[in-house]
Interface confidence: medium
């Protein structure tokens, strides 16, 4: 047993152009308010599945009104901590949503209008009993900063919360009469002692003599900032300067979905998952009613009689998408093996293979590399009749012979330090910047200046963007 | 897959009460709005009530209003509807629906095409 708590530090428009000013409508003010969801699992779950770790809600943040002409403030928001608690064991692996609401104040027929602003999906890692993990994120055209972590309750001990501790002062039997107690472990309140060197802040064990590490970090001793980290698993105002990594660009960075549409990558490309109420490329179209004709590829609408009430299309086979857009992609299950190209025919999947390789699914290997060898404990890869060499870090060339310096470029920007390791380059930025390459500057009140345990918001403070 | 089972239902004499509860197998917690929908015979489906976001907020159908009163127990999974004063208009068959969500951007709690999970029914029959 424990509680996932998730503390919600700024939610805002996001950098850039085109950042709404309001997250009210025309019709009066409005207020904000935050729903968390937990599912199990790192893998894609329908959007319909249930919270099956627990849901949470905040309480309704004070009154917004937006005032014409004035710069857009940071958005009031909900006081406190939001709580999910879990009865059985942590599982590790889960999916995080947070959802942010908006009540609309003005009058409505029929009671307030409920509608949401943005939604925010994220697959994690954590440990339970580790510390605050912090993520900043984009839906649409807002952003959301917050903070999470998930601790143990009452006996319950360990990165899962399944080990029980008894009280040092608590009888070793049970009374008379009763079932045998559920096994408990004397003194558990004395941590494991780690693997020699294991990181204090970033590492931890539940056996002795191990180390792992929490999400950001790798290495033997989890000292090393992992290629992938988003910042999680740091704590304290040094982590500008920790090397800490953000994603390179990709497709879905700078918003291209609006009004809370999702974004997911796709090759050279991007798609937007539109919420209920909106298509388009980007989401851009909006107010929309069955009387529109919404629903694409000969989907059946059924909607409200009134103008407001939303609508859902029915997708003939072969489509999906809210709004039937999509046509379902049997080639995203990605069956052409060894890099082939896939054809959906409609009527059947054919694979392209490259040079080298044949078959149905491109699985018979026409073998480049018999007899192949690449130095310095490069790899050979198949393809196109002739091999190709995977070098190992710090070397290069057609057989890996040649040593390549990773940094010699000087990809550091912002005066940030270069340092090659097995895993790639690690950027350590100087103090005021942030991202792969330090490319980001941090905002003035900065990530950095998180505490350790975020506090509670109190009623009345000023609530600043990090 | 998420299931809910409907009981309580019954016959009774006008102005009396019955309480239905909605079994749920998954938590309710989880739900967007977890509602009350009733159908006679010959007419449409209707909403009755609805609750969502775990509590925060109720609806419920004027033709209710006053008389009914939607509730849910977290710790049980269960959502209940008190029904007092019944008339003998309010026989019907009454289902319990989850909404767990479909990307949606709105709620619209009495609408019965808004709700992805639905019970079997329970019938409730009120004799004058």
């Known amino acids: 047993a424990g509680v996932f708590e998730l503390q919600i530090h700024s939610f805002g428009p996001g950098p850039g152009p085109g950042a709404p000013r309001s997250p009210c409508s025309a019709r009066g003010p409005c207020r904000l308010f935050f729903r968390v969801c937990l599912k199990p699992g790192l893998s894609e779950e329908a959007a319909e599945s249930p919270c099956a770790l627990g849901a949470a809600l905040s309480a309704r943040g004070p009154v917004y009104t937006e005032q014409p002409e004035a710069p857009a403030p940071d958005l009031p928001l909900p006081n406190g901590l939001l709580q999910v608690p879990f009865r059985d064991a942590w599982p590790g692996t889960f999916s995080l949503i947070i959802e942010t609401w908006r009540e609309e104040l003005g009058d409505q027929i029929g009671g307030p209008a409920w509608s949401l602003l943005a939604r925010v999906t994220r697959r994690r890692r954590l440990a339970a009993g580790g510390p605050w993990a912090r993520d900043i994120q984009r839906a649409g055209a807002w952003e959301l900063r917050f903070s999470y972590r998930a601790r143990c309750e009452l006996l319950a001990v360990g990165t899962a919360c399944t080990r029980l501790c008894r009280p040092r002062s608590a009888p070793s039997r049970c009374g008379p009469g009763l079932r045998p107690c559920a096994p408990l472990e004397d003194e558990c309140e004395a941590p494991p002692v780690c693997r020699a060197g294991c990181s204090l802040e970033h590492g931890f064990c539940e056996q002795p003599g191990e180390c792992r590490c929490l999400e950001g970090w790798t290495g033997p001793l989890c000292t090393v900032p992992a290629s992938t980290s988003s910042c999680l698993g740091l704590r304290g105002p040094s982590s500008a300067t920790t090397g800490c990594l953000v994603p390179g660009p990709g497709p879905c960075d700078g918003n291209p979905c609006a009004n809370g549409g999702s974004c997911s990558e796709t090759p050279g490309s991007f798609e937007c998952t539109c919420p209920r109420g909106f298509y388009g490329l980007r989401c851009e179209v909006s107010g929309v009613t069955c009387a529109d004709g919404p629903c694409f590829n000969g989907g059946l609408c059924v909607g409200g009689a009134d103008p407001d009430s939303a609508y859902i299309c029915h997708c003939p086979p072969g489509f999906q998408g809210s709004n039937c857009e999509k046509r379902v992609d049997r080639c995203s299950l990605q069956p052409c093996r060894n890099g082939g190209l896939c054809l959906d025919l409609g009527h059947a999947l054919r694979c392209r293979c490259r040079a080298g390789f044949a078959g149905p699914r491109c699985e018979h290997n026409l073998d480049d590399c018999a007899g192949r060898a690449c130095a310095n404990g490069g790899t050979c890869v198949e393809g196109g009749g002739a091999h190709r060499c995977s070098c190992a870090l710090g070397f290069g060339g057609r057989d890996c012979r040649e040593r390549a310096d990773p940094c010699a470029a000087r990809p550091c920007a912002h005066g940030g330090r270069c340092y090659a390791h097995f895993s790639g380059l690690v950027c350590a930025c100087a103090p005021g910047y942030m991202g792969s390459r330090c490319e980001f500057p941090v905002h003035p009140d900065g990530v950095s200046a998180l505490p350790a345990a975020p506090p509670g918001l109190r009623p009345g403070d000023p609530q600043r963007y990090l | 897959e998420v299931q809910l089972v409907e009981s309580g239902g019954g016959s009774v004499q006008a102005g009396g009460s019955l309480r239905l509860s909605c079994a749920a197998s998954?938590?309710?917690?989880?739900?967007?709005?977890m509602g009350w929908f009733r159908q006679a015979p010959g007419k449409e489906r209707e909403g009755v009530a609805a609750?969502?976001?775990?509590?925060?907020?109720?609806h419920y159908a004027d033709s209710v209003k006053g008389r009914f009163t939607i509730s849910q127990d977290n710790a049980k999974n269960t959502v209940y509807l008190q029904m007092n004063s019944l008339k003998p208009e309010d026989t019907a068959m009454y289902y319990c629906?989850?909404?767990?969500?479909?990307?949606?951007?709105?709620?619209?709690?009495?609408?019965?095409?808004?709700?992805?999970?639905w019970g079997q029914g329970t019938q409730v029959t009120v004799s004058s």
């Open positions: 629906a989850a909404d767990f969500g479909r990307d949606k951007n709105y709620l619209r709690p009495l609408l019965p095409h808004a709700y992805n999970y």
């Open positions: 998954v938590y309710t917690s989880s739900s967007y709005c």
């Open positions: 609750m969502c976001f775990g509590g925060l907020v109720t």
